[in-house]
């Protein structure tokens, strides 16, 4: 987690700040959801354990043309140490069921809130 702030940032963003911003973005998505998120697109669910950020990105990056999650995709890339491209699934990412993006975001949000409360920022 080096420089999540981008070029305009005065320095590296603390992990706690980065996680809080990701949580805020997911909250924003769930609260502003009127029509079905990403037209009801379905993505692979993930195990919310080790490698979660990369797995989440690997799943969501396959959804294109959905502006509502573009910022989330960018933010997740800052948490993942390797480059992720569409169609790429690591050995950690077991593909066993697909769920709607809206449910994926809700599940991820609940887990990230738990991590934040417990002080697990990396």
């Amino acid at each position: 987690l080096t420089c999540l702030g981008g070029f305009a940032s005065p320095g590296p963003v603390p992990p706690s700040t980065a996680l809080r911003e990701l949580i805020e973005e997911l909250v924003n998505i769930t609260q502003n959801q009127k029509a079905p998120l990403c037209n009801g697109s379905m993505v692979w669910s993930i195990n919310l354990t080790a490698g979660m950020y990369c797995a989440a990105l690997e799943s969501l990056i396959n959804v294109s043309g959905c502006s509502a999650i573009e910022k989330t995709q960018r933010m997740l890339s800052g948490f993942c140490p390797h480059k992720v491209s569409a169609g790429q699934f690591s050995s950690l990412h077991v593909r066993d069921t697909k769920i709607e993006v809206a449910q994926f975001v809700k599940d991820l949000l609940l887990h990230l809130k738990k991590l934040f409360r417990e002080g697990q920022f990396n």
């Epitope: 990403c38 037209n39 009801g40 396959n62």
Partner: nanobody, 116 residues
Framework: EVQLLESGGGLVQPGGSLRLSCAAS????????MDWVRQAPGKGREWVST????????WYADSVKGRFTISRDNSKNTLYLQMNGLRAEDTAVYYC?????????WGQGTLVTVSS
């Protein structure tokens, strides 16, 4: 323009079989992962199965594993779902979908009713 046209649904008795087809056009079919998704009356959308672009890899929801088989014929731009051992809880409208695109590209679906 992406078009998906499902067919093959109907009324079948419990334990019976049906084969659904989906004719695809408007995109490079053999490059796309494809899904079958269903929606039971008054319920939300449920993922059923996915097949890789080549057809070599397949995935199934636990509820249909061992009973349903997804396949594709890339030379005919067609996706299939062979449904055996049908149960009342399989009653739904079945849609084929270009993976990750949502229902903006779904067809009209095909109704499967399992009843004695």
């Amino acid at each position: 323009e992406v078009q998906l046209l499902e067919s093959g649904g109907g009324l079948v008795q419990p334990g019976g079989s049906l084969r659904l087809s989906c004719a695809a056009s408007g995109f490079t079919f053999d490059r796309e992962e494809m899904d079958w998704v269903r929606q039971a009356p008054g319920k939300g959308r449920e993922w059923v199965s996915t097949i890789s672009p080549s057809g070599r890899k397949t995935w199934y929801a636990d509820s249909v594993k061992g009973r349903f088989t997804i396949s594709r014929d890339n030379s005919k731009n067609t996706l299939y779902l062979q449904m055996n051992g049908l149960r009342a809880e399989d009653t739904a409208v079945y849609y084929c979908a270009k993976a990750y695109t949502g229902f903006r590209y779904w067809g009209q679906g095909t109704l499967v009713t399992v009843s004695s």
